[in-house]
Interface confidence: low
């Protein structure tokens, strides 16, 4: 086999792809020194080891630059598959989420898991709930036994991706009307109450529109 190798590859072992980028190379052990800028990677094959020179280090390793020779060093970060440096992971093992160079089995508070990339991204942040509004039904505060009261909250920070849902920004609950019968037997609310209802409706609409404006802006920017 050895002789046939020499006959078919007259130039020398350098035509063996494993010797690409080497300054010194042997058929049995591969590279022992690499050209400038390339990374030396020591690979195990059973009981054997061989060296190769690579432009970038394989998965599970990072490029460590040194004056004598650049080397591929193994990632030591827990649950990390590939890393950029000894303490910054770029891809986590299956089932773990990447967050600021580390791997977590669940995303920290305020961050949401993005399943397609297995990263933790900034979640949707909402403000505090407003007070419950006036109990009303069909925009009236009298004339019925039961009505609905609503409260709202605003989006403080939109999510990093529009696929990440924001929590509810308006919610309603059943309430008992303060006045079962309208004064003077009329079912129409007073002018002042009418103004209040209008204000409250606008507040709810604004809060609900806010999220869709964010989404529309995001899509336009993509």
């Amino acid at each position: 086999q050895g002789n046939r190798w020499r006959r078919s590859k007259r130039a020398s072992y350098v035509s063996n792809p494993i010797c690409k980028g080497c300054l010194s190379c042997s058929k049995d052990n591969g590279c022992s020194r690499c050209q400038q800028k390339l990374f030396f990677f020591l690979r195990r094959e059973g009981m054997r080891q061989y060296g190769e020179c690579l432009h970038s280090c394989p998965s599970g390793y990072y490029g460590h630059r040194a004056p004598d020779m650049n080397r591929c060093a193994r990632c030591r970060i827990e649950n990390c598959d590939s890393c950029f440096s000894k303490d910054f992971c770029t891809k986590c093992k299956v089932g773990f989420y990447l967050h600021r160079g580390r791997c977590f089995d669940e995303c920290p508070d305020g961050f949401a898991p993005l399943e397609e990339t297995m990263e933790c991204v900034e979640g949707c942040e909402v403000g505090h709930w407003s007070e419950w509004g006036t109990c009303s039904r069909n925009n009236r505060t009298c004339g019925f036994k039961w009505g609905l009261e609503t409260r709202t909250r605003q989006i403080v920070k939109k999510p990093a991706k529009d696929t990440i849902p924001c929590p509810t920004i308006a919610e309603s609950r059943r309430c008992k009307m303060a006045m079962r019968h309208c004064p003077g037997g009329k079912r129409t609310p007073k002018a002042k109450e009418k103004r209040n209802k209008k204000k409250k409706r606008k507040l709810i609409e604004r809060a609900q529109e806010q999220h869709s404006v964010f989404l529309a802006t995001d899509r336009a920017n993509q």
């Epitope: 086999q1 046939r4 035509s15 792809p17 690409k20 598959d81």
Partner: antibody
Framework: QIQLQESGPGLVKPSQSLSLTCSVT????????WSWIRQFPGKKLEWMGY???????YYNPSLENRISITRDTSKNQFFLHLKSVTTEDTATYYC?????????????WGQGIQVTVSS | ELVFTQPQSVSGSLGQEISISCTRS????????VSWYQQQSSNKPRLLIY?????PSGVPDRFSGSTDSSSNSGILTISRLQPEDEGDYYC????????FGSGTQLTLL
Amino acid sequence: QIQLQESGPGLVKPSQSLSLTCSVTGNSITSSDWSWIRQFPGKKLEWMGYMNYGGGTYYNPSLENRISITRDTSKNQFFLHLKSVTTEDTATYYCARERPHPYAYFDVWGQGIQVTVSS
Amino acid sequence: ELVFTQPQSVSGSLGQEISISCTRSSGNIGSNYVSWYQQQSSNKPRLLIYKFDQRPSGVPDRFSGSTDSSSNSGILTISRLQPEDEGDYYCLSGYDKYVFGSGTQLTLL
């Protein structure tokens, strides 16, 4: 003597996930690299992805969004998980021992398992 | 996308020598190793040649591998054809993504 044996369901419904197991005897999975390869009914072979001895994975870019390869070192098994299957995923699935980059060859193969995707 | 093209079929007579080519679509055939596999009647593939021209133990020396830079191809040569050589033959190459050749059916006349 190294032996590989695939196991798993022979029939999977479209849109479901496919999970296969490769049981290895005669070789610790932590000392070699392992691949999944499939062969379509028209005989075309496709390399799906590999897991190196340290547990690192590399996948065929055409399957990257659907595939994951995991392992259980205590049982000396590695697994193929393929999400959202379609009838196009009907094939014979092989696990194989891979001689490492850059040598690119598979010296030991399992018998293969026929998987049909159909409703 | 990297593609390795093989002839769909080749045929030969008993005792004859045949060659199967595996032509790389882009890039140099010598930049990644080439291996060859034999598959008989829907059995599992069997490694015949690795690292261009190396033969695993148990594979007869009638099987040999080489490269032809002028056609940018890997070549599998089978000499002294035997009846048991009938079947499908596949090449494989690549680095970060392995790609199999399209496959060649060998039939004996």
